[in-house]
């Protein structure tokens, strides 16, 4: 066995949007670090057969199966999948190892199965078996985390009822606003379910599994902060737990906090208080109001009062079903070719939405930002000045929302011409949509100024690029016009563009562009 090659089999997972079938190549994509597939010699098999660990791939995911061979001399190879041979192109890496790759783009059911790689080196022949299966994600769920008080302790437990079981982490920040962004140095993450340190400025709990990541912020009223111009609002669905934290800092311990709902003190057992001294010897008190399962009658103004601070309130609204409130009327925009512009949707929603921006059947990531007035906004700026129809789609499990936008880019027409035996056609995608003129070029009119008044038919049509309009003009050819040059011109407020066509017998026509 000493002349057997040293081989390593790896899986590379790609984050890509391209679609294709298996490619035996090294394909440029953003990749995660390789995972060892532990190729092991298959016992009791005829010939030398290595077996890689089975790989599970999500539908539409892209992967590379790769073999690194430490063997002297050249190697040749062949991939076989479902009795079909696939091209194989080995290359050598910087360590002079032979590298053979199979790229599977946009995994589908038909691409699952056994991939056999036959390798022939100067010393030996051997086979490597890869098994690729589709991950069964039908039962997967990812639910937003919620809070519970830990029995007999002043601590919060974060719970997310998800499949597969998620990793739960607390995300803590003691700064204000922008500095509490996820990757900020001010943010501390604790991968545990129970949190004892409940005095921080910003407290969130996040749960993540293969479906993604969902977070819930601990709703907080800070009596030392200037109140927002609009009353903070908290939405919950019937049956969900309510948690509101009131926080206040004072120079000494001589102050107390209380919660009221619609001017009535909360019942015993639906609040608890904690206090601590901060580094500068000031006293921090927090008072939690909680309801383990809210009903419609828990709706109202929750007011936190202090003997040493102005009181502040929040409006808690209990709804039967989630919602997305936004105006769904379509919007049209007209911009210059180099003008900076972003689409924007302002909405109020509960639970938090998942959203996408789509253009020409391609989905783009969607970011949302919370505003001070309880609304959120999602902007899309990555249109690259491509005209057409853009779609914003949002959903949150209870509600769906779609809004259409049309983007028109102001530009001078560009004319494309084609001709057949009986007609000549010109089209243009300039904006505003151009108007057309046809001129005849002759001995009498060498500059092509003679108008063609008849036989012209203009129309506008939707182009393949979704939502982009194209204007076209067709000239029906009479026998008398054959052999002449004609000129079609498209013009709008930004300029004119023309194309000259020789009207002769059918076949390829020469065009002379002329701006």
């Amino acid at each position: 066995n000493q002349d057997l090659p040293v081989i390593k089999c790896v899986l590379i997972n790609h984050k890509n949007n391209d679609s294709s079938v298996g490619k035996s190549s090294s394909y440029p994509m953003v990749s995660e670090s390789p995972e060892d597939l532990g190729c092991a010699l298959r016992p009791q098999s005829a010939g030398t057969v290595y077996e890689a660990a089975t790989v599970e791939v999500d539908v539409s995911a892209s992967i590379t199966l790769q073999v690194l061979v430490d063997t002297p001399g050249n190697i040749s190879c062949l991939w076989v999948f479902k009795h079909s041979s696939l091209n194989c192109q080995p290359h050598f890496d910087v360590q002079n190892r032979g590298v053979v790759s199979m790229v599977i783009l946009k995994m589908t059911e038909t691409q699952a199965g056994e991939y056999l790689l036959f390798i022939q080196s100067e010393a030996t022949n051997y086979t490597i078996v890869f098994t690729v299966s589709i991950r069964n994600t039908l039962l997967f769920t990812l639910r937003r985390p919620y809070f519970r008080k830990m029995e007999n302790q002043d601590a919060l437990v974060c719970i997310s009822e998800s499949v597969p079981e998620p990793i739960v982490e607390w995300v803590l920040c003691d700064s204000q606003g922008e500095s509490c962004k996820e990757e900020s140095p001010a943010v501390v993450k604790k991968e545990e379910k129970v949190l004892h340190e409940l005095f921080g400025t910003d407290i969130r709990c996040c749960a993540r599994n293969e479906l993604g990541r969902e977070c819930t912020r601990l709703f907080t009223i800070d009596l030392n902060q200037t109140p927002q111009t609009t009353l903070p609002q908290l939405f919950l669905k019937v049956g969900e737990p309510l948690w509101i934290r009131c926080k206040a800092v004072h120079v000494n311990h001589g102050f107390g906090l209380t919660w009221e709902l619609e001017n009535k003190a909360l019942e015993e057992g639906s609040y608890f208080e904690m206090s601590t001294y901060s580094t500068n010897r000031t006293m921090i008190r927090i008072l939690f109001a909680f309801v383990s399962s809210v009903a419609r009658n828990d709706t109202g103004y929750y007011t936190c009062s202090s003997s040493k601070h102005p009181s502040q309130s929040a409006l808690v609204t209990i709804v039967e079903k989630g919602f997305i409130n936004a105006t769904n009327s379509s919007e049209d925009y007209e911009i210059d070719q180099y003008e900076e512009f972003c689409f924007s949707v302002r909405f109020k929603a509960y639970p938090q939405i998942r959203c996408t921006w789509t253009f020409s059947r391609k989905a783009f990531p969607c970011e949302q930002k919370a505003l001070d007035d309880g609304y959120s906004v999602s902007k899309f700026c990555n249109h690259k000045h491509q005209p057409g129809e853009y779609i914003f789609h949002a959903e949150n499990g209870d509600a769906q929302f779609t809004k259409m936008f049309t983007l028109n880019i102001r530009r001078k027409p560009q004319v494309l011409a084609e001709a057949s035996a009986s007609q000549a056609s010109c089209s243009s995608d300039g904006y505003p949509l151009p108007s057309w003129t046809w001129k005849k070029c002759s001995d009498k009119s060498p500059n092509c100024t003679e108008d063609i008044p008849e036989g012209v038919w203009n129309r506008k049509a939707n182009r393949k690029v979704f939502g982009q309009w194209v204007s076209s003009s067709t000239l029906n050819m009479s026998e008398a016009m054959k052999g002449f040059l004609v000129k079609c011109c498209a013009y709008n407020s930004l300029g004119t563009s023309c194309e000259t066509i020789l009207l002769n017998s059918p076949g390829p026509f020469p065009f002379i562009q002329d701006s």
Epitope: L11, N13, E35, D36, L37, G38, C39, A40, E51, A52, A53, T54, V55, E56, V57, T131, S133, R135, N136, T137, L138, L139, F140, V163, P164, E165, I167, E191, E192, N209, E210
Partner: nanobody, 125 residues
């Protein structure tokens, strides 16, 4: 870090049944692909069955297909192997195994990150 502890092994007659359990400690049990391997005296350790980290997909060696069933209960942090129609050639030490990836199924020994200490199954009349 995951610790694995097998139980349920013992002596059984040919044609009989046995259920092996593997209790795992560690917070993120459901993040691991799990499997069972076995090693008969004087032989190499071989793959028996594997289950994806979610429990959605299962994989079996040809020699046990239709007789053995692998399952997992993420809420109890436990892996199971239900063995029916046992044969003398199933006699071996059975090991519980966990991989370190959610994409790679533990169907070969090199991808195993954590092993249990093993439980002996003897099939004999």
């Amino acid at each position: 870090e995951v610790q694995l502890l097998e139980s349920g092994g013992g002596l059984v007659q040919p044609g009989g049944s046995l259920t092996l359990s593997c209790a795992a400690s560690g917070r993120t049990f459901s993040s691991y692909a799990l499997g069972w391997f076995r090693q008969a005296p004087g032989k190499e350790r071989e793959f028996v069955a594997a289950i994806s980290w979610s429990g959605g997909n299962t994989y079996y060696a040809d020699s046990v297909k239709g007789r053995f069933t692998i399952s997992r209960d993420n809420s109890k942090n436990t892996l199971y192997l239900q063995m029916n129609s046992l044969r003398a050639e199933d006699t071996a030490v059975y090991y519980c195994a966990a991989g370190g990836s959610t994409r790679v199924v533990v169907t070969t020994t090199p991808v195993v990150k954590y092993w249990g200490q093993g439980t002996l199954v003897t099939v004999s009349s």
